[in-house]
């Protein structure tokens, strides 16, 4: 017998390790909290929905409870969806949550609240208000929380939840929290640092604030702070894609010398975008620990050719200098000061938006001998010259990025060319950097309301390709022409971006010739020209290939195409080809013995397979080894009879979704003997095979989601005993068989879905209806989306809480 | 700009405490800046006393923490300096300046006062 | 207490002389040096903070350097105004100074 009931319209999961039961209802359209949540459950997701009020009985019976998420049930019309705007705060009547001994962490951001709730238990040690209408901190609202360690007060005022009155806190409000580690006060208008904060912080987050001044004395008491963020106060606002006032005059954040001098655990300092124009060594005085540095957005060009205060940070691993150019200037090239060669521990350094014209070898020598050293990101800097054999010192790094600059084999050092293209160059960059988000986001710690933890995304290299080692990113470059003396001495080289130039070569084999280790390349969004089969063939040690988006010679007539250029790679494993518009091919096959993956999406098969012309139906034949095939989005409205046959023998996975096809013959399913995941979604089908099972004996996953089938046969389902997941969501069913579905295939399915179809619950429906109510099998949505269009009385109603006892009394009958 | 004038008597008997004032004008000593004491003994070197931060906060140099107290009138933008049990060895000239604790180092005294002799004699 | 020593404690020099005063300190002051300059009846001014930062209005023609124990004040054309009295001082711990380096006219 199941321990809760079909009913409750939210996914329930048991974390065997923790001793966690895990209800989660996240954005299930709730108005109220529903019944059946069992009883010994430990984690209660209600964000994303409209439940308007909270009481003593909301969590009655729910003793366990160790964790409540209850954000986003009334989000601040600024922050909120326009079409379902929330016009009355949640209400939280007294005690609600005093009876639940065992709570530890209580969510209740983005709910328009106006105070601290009271009544919290003593047991609680996280409490998340953020995004809420509290904008007066009071020492006798926090007196309930002796216990708590994790405090989250931030976004309750700011541009997109404006609050119109300065945030106030009282002095020593914070004083009596005597276990808090973690404070949050971000994007929240505070005008000076709250004192006297307690002892026990470890991480105090101030940042998108309007604190213009530290005080010597801010922090003279947190001597066990591990991280501190005082980014976005005095922001840089040159660019700023949010609404952004700079201190007076431009000013910076005024920190004084000595303001730093407790904090000997720190591990973690954020002075993003605080207008800083010197950075004084003596802040670094007694942080010795120190193992992250962000200094990106402020104005520190100069203090880069000088840095003493480098001297300071023997521990230091993160540090990021990105966007300190100097306004309407164009560099010649880059100045680090020599103290960077004293960053010994250093692993990662970030130097984006220097913003200068060449890239010369004598410039990073202060970093030859930082043996840490893993990733130089020296992006989006207008970079036009680099001759880059100079990073044959730095074979040990994982990453060099040298994206998004201006790099072209045509560079000539003679030319300085400083004014000319000073000015055009800083402006011609500001919607690429939007594009980013990252260094320009206002708050890219920010949490949305589907997910609770803090979402730092950090835009990095593509990670599939970092993963096979030291990477070389060019992507987003000027690049129109490539050599193979542009690579000499980086035969170190396991990957290898050029995505987003200008390439519109004859590749030959000889270009890539150095890179005898490479193992990655992306050479999508460039113009290949593939005249010749030996393309690429140097990369003896490529695995993957991705020339995807390189659709400017395949859409022109007349040109020839060697698509059988696959057969020279001879360890090639992935080959990505998506979005080309192939319609053509000078040769009839691809070959391979390696290829093990091939994505051929947003292509012309279309053509290529056009009835009457059998040329190209062996296409894929010979890639001997090829397991998966993704031929999605080929405008494929029917496939010609020769298309199975003329497959990979040992094709495993076959993706055929979003192609427009009207019909399938599933029986030619019978060639691919070893197929294990059939994808036909996104289609305009109408049948399913009268019997999978004769069709193909391998299939264990089977997705037709987002296609017109209104029934399925009588046998559908009939010993197809090795099916493990069926997708039937977002058809037209309107009536399941038992025939159909019978219980010996059923019992072995791991998910079906089954949601977003037009179900009609008359009295024909009642197997299926008790079906739904007493299978193990997991069907997702079931409380929620799997639901009747009719008739009238049950429409919209969701078919497992059906009562059809009337058509059960007519059967007995 | 900022201007700061040591005042106080000139003469001081031995084991009495010596107490001189430093008037501060266009600036207000809570805004900013820690406000010095240093004395020069004669033909010696200038010595640091201590100082009274903008926020009311003292240090003293080790060697003469036991003698000396360092206050501020903030109604009249003065700070002060009691140095007890003096000896002829507090003959000396005294002092007044100022550190910016926003600029870029320590003790980096960007603002003296003249000078005011003080004699310890009886 | 970390100690300052200054050397030379005088020296003569004509107007258009390139003038250098050293300073050593007992122990590494990690550059936190700085060098004033006093005349008779004048409040002190701050010349170089920092080993080689230029205090505001002070003339390019002074100059600093040095690391670690050793440091240096260079005036690279003697002017007649510059003849005073400067001394250096640490400001790592405590502040310390120098016995003064008297610049008198030859």
């Known amino acids: 017998a199941r321990w809760f009931p079909k009913t409750l319209p939210c996914d329930v999961t048991l974390d065997v390790p923790k001793n966690h039961v895990i209800v989660d209802c996240t954005d299930k359209h709730l108005t109220e909290i529903p019944g059946g949540i069992p009883t010994n459950t430990t984690n209660l997701t209600l964000t994303i929905n409209h439940i308007p009020d909270i009481s003593p009985a909301s969590f009655h019976r729910l003793d366990h409870l160790v964790e409540i998420d209850f954000r986003c049930n009334c989000v601040p019309i600024p922050l909120g969806s326009k079409n379902n705007m929330c016009i009355k705060r949640l209400q939280i009547k007294p005690r609600s949550f005093s009876g639940l001994t065992y709570l530890k962490s209580l969510y209740l951001d983005g709910n328009q609240l106006l105070e601290i709730p009271q009544g919290l238990p003593p047991s609680l040690q996280l409490l998340s208000l953020e995004a809420n209408n509290i904008f007066s901190i009071r020492k006798e609202n926090l007196t309930e929380l002796a216990n708590i360690e994790i405090l989250y007060l931030g976004q309750n005022c700011y541009y997109r939840n404006p609050c119109y009155v300065s945030y106030s806190i009282e002095k020593d409000a914070f004083l009596n929290l005597t276990k808090l580690k973690v404070l949050s006060l971000k994007d929240n208008n505070v005008t000076a640092v709250p004192t006297v904060l307690p002892s026990t912080l470890t991480e105090l987050y101030l940042y998108n604030n309007m604190i213009a001044k530290i005080q010597e004395d801010d922090f003279n008491n947190l001597n066990q702070l591990q991280i501190l963020d005082l980014s976005g106060n005095c922001p840089r606002c040159y660019n700023a894609p949010f609404p952004c006032a700079p201190c007076k005059n431009n000013s910076p954040l005024q920190i004084p010398v000595n303001a730093f001098d407790a904090l000997t655990e720190l591990k973690v300092l954020r002075l993003h975008s605080n207008s800083l124009q010197h950075v004084p060594p003596r802040w670094f005085k007694n942080i010795n620990k120190l193992q992250e540095l962000d200094l990106s957005q402020n104005f520190l060009a100069k203090e880069i050719g000088d840095a003493k205060f480098l001297h300071f940070l023997p521990s230091l691993i993160q540090l990021d200098l990105s966007f300190n150019f100097e306004l309407q200037v164009y560099r010649a090239s880059m100045n680090l000061s020599q103290a960077f060669s004293s960053l010994k521990s250093l692993k990662i350094l970030r130097i984006r938006g220097y913003v200068f014209k060449e890239l010369k070898s004598f410039n990073l020598s202060p970093l030859h001998n930082l043996q840490n050293l893993e990733v130089l990101d020296l992006g989006t800097n207008f970079i036009k010259i680099a001759n880059l054999s100079m990073f044959k010192q730095f074979k040990r790094l994982k990453v060099i990025d040298l994206s998004v600059n201006k790099i072209s084999p045509s560079g000539d050092s003679s030319e300085v060319g400083f004014c000319s293209n000073a000015r055009t160059s800083v402006e011609s960059y500001e919607p690429q950097v939007l594009e980013q988000l990252h260094y320009f986001r206002y708050d890219k710690y920010a949490r949305s309301c589907r997910f609770k933890n803090k979402e730092a995304s950090f835009m990095s290299v593509n990670e599939s390709c970092y993963k096979y080692g030291q990477t070389l990113d060019l992507s987003k470059n000027s690049i129109f022409f490539v050599k193979s003396s542009d690579f000499q001495h980086l035969s170190f080289l396991k990957c290898l971006n050029l995505s987003g130039n200008l390439i519109s070569q004859t590749l030959n084999g000889s270009e890539f010739q150095p890179l005898a280790e490479l193992r990655y390349l992306d050479f999508s969004n460039n113009r290949l020209d593939l005249l010749h089969s030996t393309a690429f063939e140097e990369l003896h040690k490529l695995e993957v290939l991705d020339i995807s988006s390189n659709s400017h010679y395949f859409q022109s007539e007349g040109i020839t195409h060697m698509l059988n250029f696959t057969k020279n790679l001879k360890v090639l494993q992935k080959l990505m080809m998506n979005d080309n518009d192939i319609s053509s091919s000078t040769s009839r096959t691809m070959e391979s013995e390696s290829l093990r993956t091939l994505e051929f999406r947003g292509n012309h098969l279309d053509v290529l397979w056009r009835e009457g012309d059998n040329r190209y139906l062996q296409l894929f034949k010979n890639l001997l080894k090829l397991e998966e095939l993704d031929i999605s989005k080929n405008s494929l409205s029917f496939l010609p009879s020769g298309v199975f046959d003329g497959m990979p023998p040992n094709l495993k996975n076959l993706s055929l979704a979003k192609n427009g096809l009207k019909s399938f013959s599933w029986k030619k399913l019978q060639c691919l003997k070893n197929l294990e995941t059939l994808d036909l979604s996104h289609n305009q089908l109408t049948t399913v095979p009268e019997r999978l099972s004769n069709c193909s004996r391998s299939l264990k996953n089977l997705i037709l989601k987002n296609n017109q089938i209104r029934s399925l046969t009588k046998y559908f389902l009939q010993d197809a005993f090795q099916l493990r997941y069926l997708d039937l969501s977002s058809n037209k069913i309107q009536m399941i068989q038992k025939t159909s579905f019978p219980e010996n295939v059923l019992n072995n399915l791991k998910m079906l879905l089954l949601h977003h179809n037009r179900f009609l619950c008359t009295c024909d429906a009642v197997w299926f209806v008790w079906w739904v109510n007493h299978t193990e099998v997991t069907i997702p949505y079931l409380a929620t989306d799997v639901t009747c269009v009719g008739p009238g009385a049950h429409k919209g109603q969701s078919v497992i809480s059906l009562d059809l006892y009337t058509c059960e009394l007519d059967l007995t009958n | 700009d900022v201007q700061l004038q040591e005042s106080g008597p000139g003469l001081v008997k031995p084991s009495d405490t010596l107490s001189l004032t430093c008037t501060v004008t266009?600036?207000?000593?809570?805004?900013?800046?820690?406000w010095n004491w240093i004395r020069q003994p004669p033909g010696n070197k200038l010595e640091w006393i201590g100082h009274?931060?903008?926020?009311?906060?003292?240090n003293y140099n080790p060697s003469l923490k036991s003698r000396v107290t360092i206050s501020r009138d903030t109604s009249k933008n003065q700070f002060s300096l009691k140095l007890s049990s003096v000896t002829a060895a507090d003959t000396a000239v005294y002092y007044c300046?100022?550190?910016?604790?926003?600029?870029?180092?320590?003790?980096?005294?960007?603002?003296w006062g003249q000078g005011t002799t003080v004699t310890v004699s009886s | 207490d970390i100690q300052m020593t200054q050397s030379p404690s005088s020296l003569s020099a004509s107007v258009g002389d390139r003038v250098t005063i050293t300073c050593r300190a007992s122990?590494?002051?990690?550059?936190?040096l700085n060098w004033y300059q006093q005349k008779p009846g004048k409040a002190v001014k701050l010349l170089i903070y920092?080993?080689?930062r230029l205090h505001s209005g002070v003339p390019s023609r002074f100059s600093g350097s040095g690391s670690g124990t050793d440091y240096t004040l260079t005036i690279s054309s003697l002017q007649p105004e510059d003849f005073a009295t400067y001394f250096c001082?640490?400001?790592?711990?405590?502040?310390?100074f120098g016995q003064g380096t008297k610049v008198e006219i030859k």
């Open positions: 009274i931060s903008y926020r009311g906060n003292t």
């Open positions: 300046a100022s550190w910016n604790y926003y600029g870029y180092v320590d003790y980096a005294m960007d603002y």
């Open positions: 266009g600036y207000s000593i809570t805004s900013d800046y820690a």
């Open positions: 122990q590494d002051i990690s550059n936190y």
């Open positions: 001082q640490q400001g790592d711990t405590f502040p310390t």
């Open positions: 920092y080993t080689s």
